[in-house]
Interface confidence: low
Amino acid sequence: ITQQDLAPQQRVAPQQKRSSPSEGLCPPGHHISEDGRDCISCKYGQDYSTHWNDLLFCLRCTRCDSGEVELSPCTTTRNTVCQCEEGTFREEDSPEMCRKCRTGCPRGMVKVGDCTPWSDIECVHKESGTKHSGEAPAVEETVTSSPGTPASPCS
């Protein structure tokens, strides 16, 4: 089953369907019963499984935090996809929360990259073109830009 195959009416969790395991494994969108005899469907919008598996129960769907937007809903075979709101981004070093993008670059630097859900604005030195990394500059040192309305970090 792919996400595209799921009809809109399946958003309402249907009765859990059963089928038989194949070589001890159940297909994506299912988990195995305690006795190993049945494959039981995950509940649409509540839990999921992505691979052939022998899980005793499906994996719980992620709920997007405040400060995140839901790009795609949880299906029986795919977890929810969440993304930081406009004006915030998620760093690799701290993936658990969305952080506010800087509003501008330090003096002597120019912006070469916008705020995206995956990265802060990117600044380079005017002369050398060297990238700048570090803390957000003090307000009086900034060259302002308009990255959109800043949002609160995700909780």
Partner: nanobody, 122 residues
Framework: EVQLVESGGGLVQPGGSLRLSCAAS????????MGWYRQAPGKQRELVAE???????NYADSEKSRFTISRDNAKRTVNLQMNSLKPEDTAVYYC????????????????WGQGTQVTVSS
């Protein structure tokens, strides 16, 4: 409440063996995957091996030939047999379990033991 208690760590010479055990207890309805992770000083916690309820295993590449994970579903235990130990295996070893507590519908993947120290040194 759910508890995971590890045992079996200690000091061993290079080339030696150890058997780690972990027992889960408490308000448990069902246990999904169980596994062993380790954390060496100054390094991130990393997966060593994990095992599904029906015995399917997954090992970190470097440990595949030397380590063996096993579990007893009835006793809610998971073991890690470690052979041909090397100094780089020195770390704190943690047991992990994905547990569904009684009265709940979901497993939680974040149950951890306190850890047991394994030191490989001559």
């Amino acid at each position: 409440e759910v508890q995971l208690v590890e045992s079996g760590g200690g000091l061993v010479q290079p080339g030696g063996s150890l058997r780690l055990s972990c027992a889960a207890s408490g308000s448990i309805d069902s246990i999904n995957n169980m596994g062993w992770y380790r954390q060496a000083p100054g390094k991130q916690r990393e997966l060593v091996a994990e095992i599904t309820p029906r015995g399917r295993t997954n090992y970190a590449d470097s440990e595949k030939s030397r380590f063996t994970i096993s579990r007893d579903n009835a006793k809610r235990t998971v073991n890690l047999q470690m052979n041909s130990l090397k100094p780089e295996d020195t770390a704190v070893y943690y047991c992990n379990a994905e547990v569904r507590e009684r009265g709940t519908s979901w497993y939680r993947p974040d149950y951890w033991g306190q850890g047991t120290q394994v030191t490989v040194s001559s």
